[in-house]
């Protein structure tokens, strides 16, 4: 089952995807597409990176993080209800049938007419640090438990806890990575 993320109409949606390059600058090609990951490439490609740069993108889709350090999380600008659906992040790792494929489900909610600051729900993913939510009401600190190194098979399970697109912004600093090499 796909990991689910949420955003409101008019917001920017954030879909996390990470890997750790084997060496600085030793990047792995990545593609993002709308639709579940097929056997090769991504369906309906919206963005692609190569070993140096973002070499293909479409409007409203961009990488906000430092993709040269393996943060290939996708930002979708000013989302509409039509942006709902499954997105594929494919990390094209050298070797035989090594690609990492992640299907992320984006749910777009209608915008609230009178948004009021609301407390984030409990965040139960086990990260060994403190996270401070930002950009949506008063800052609040949540204490999180500890977790050993995250491996490839754990990343999807771990991401299950990141169901709110606003809170998912904090994942970038959390240390959740796929290690290549």
């Amino acid at each position: 089952s796909e990991v689910e993320y949420r955003a409101e109409v008019g917001q920017n949606a954030y879909l996390p995807c990470f890997y750790t390059p084997a060496a600085p600058g030793n990047l792995v090609p990545v593609c993002w597409g709308k639709g579940a990951c097929p056997v090769f490439e991504c369906g309906n490609v919206v963005l692609r990176t190569d070993e140096r740069d973002v070499n293909y993108w479409t409007s409203r889709y961009w990488l906000n993080g430092d993709f040269r350090k393996g943060d290939v999380s996708l930002t979708i600008e000013n989302v509409t209800l039509a942006d709902s659906g499954i997105y594929c992040c494919r990390i094209q790792i050298p070797g035989i049938m090594n690609d990492e494929k992640f299907n992320l489900k984006l749910v777009i909610k209608p915008a609230k007419v009178t948004p009021a600051p609301t407390r984030q729900r409990d965040f139960t993913a086990a990260f060994p640090r403190m996270l401070t939510t930002r950009g949506h009401g008063p800052a609040e600190t949540q204490t999180l438990g500890s977790l050993p190194d995250i491996n490839l098979t754990q990343i999807s399970t771990l991401a299950n806890e990141l169901r709110d697109s606003r809170l998912a912004n904090d994942l970038r600093d959390s240390g959740a990575t796929i290690r290549i090499g």
């Epitope: 097929p38 056997v39 090769f40 692609r48 094209q92």
Partner: antibody
């Protein structure tokens, strides 16, 4: 426009290794979005996907052939190649190299080599 | 692996007629289904990808539809050059697989 030119022997002895090369012209084998592939067609029958390689070195093999199969890229020569070991008469087929390019919902195409009829016989 | 069953095996039609080819998958392939045309002595040519998108340079008389397990290729008005063998192929499940083909022949 990218073109593919195949080369390699048309006759291979049983138990030997079938080796074919596909040379890419009119573009770089390092182009993102191109999946350099091998497909075969047994005489009078349908098509069978053998496998593909992406310029990053990401490789996918058909499980039915995986134990005998090697697909590799030589970026310096702008070539990719197929090696199939321990061949039998069942490997007799027309072998095609191909490139699939997927960019977005409005842009996809394929390019095929001319095909090489490979007969396995002593 | 995913089995693709094409029907009919042979379709006998005249130029100008409408051709409807069917492809059924043994399990869902989402919309990741392609159609190819092959003429004798030639390599296959991609016509339709992802169920309904025409590949670059393919005439508008070719159209594809369907999702999940049932797909259709329609040639709205057959031209003389359209008589060939047509294959469907899925790229949803590894390995990619092809159907056994439908031959469209002149009646």
């Amino acid at each position: 426009q990218v073109q593919l030119q195949q080369s390699g022997p048309g006759l291979v002895k049983p138990s030997q290794t079938l080796s074919l090369t596909c040379t890419v012209s009119g573009g770089s084998i390092n182009s993102g979005g191109h999946y350099w592939s091998w497909i075969r067609q047994h005489p009078g029958r349908g098509l069978e996907w053998i496998g593909y390689i992406y310029y990053s070195g990401s490789i996918y093999y058909n499980p039915s052939l995986k134990s005998r199969l090697t697909i590799s890229v030589d970026t310096s020569k702008n070539q990719f190649s197929l090696k199939l070991s321990s061949v039998t008469a069942a490997d007799t087929a027309v072998y095609y190299c191909a490139s699939y390019y997927y960019a977005s919902s409005g842009d996809a195409f394929d390019i095929w080599g001319q095909g090489t009829m490979v007969t396995v016989s002593s | 692996e995913t089995t693709l069953t094409q029907s009919p095996a042979t379709l006998s039609l005249s130029p100008g007629e409408r051709a409807t080819l069917s492809c059924r998958a043994s399990q869902s392939v989402s919309s990741y289904l392609a159609w190819y045309q092959q003429k004798p002595g030639q390599a296959p040519r991609l016509l339709i990808y992802d169920a309904s998108n025409r590949a670059t340079g393919i005439p508008a008389r070719f159209s594809g539809s369907g999702s999940g397990t049932d797909f259709t290729l329609t040639i709205s008005s057959l031209e003389p050059e359209d008589f060939a063998v047509y294959y469907c192929q899925q790229r949803s499940n590894w390995p990619p697989t092809f159907g056994q083909g439908t031959k469209v022949e002149i009646k």
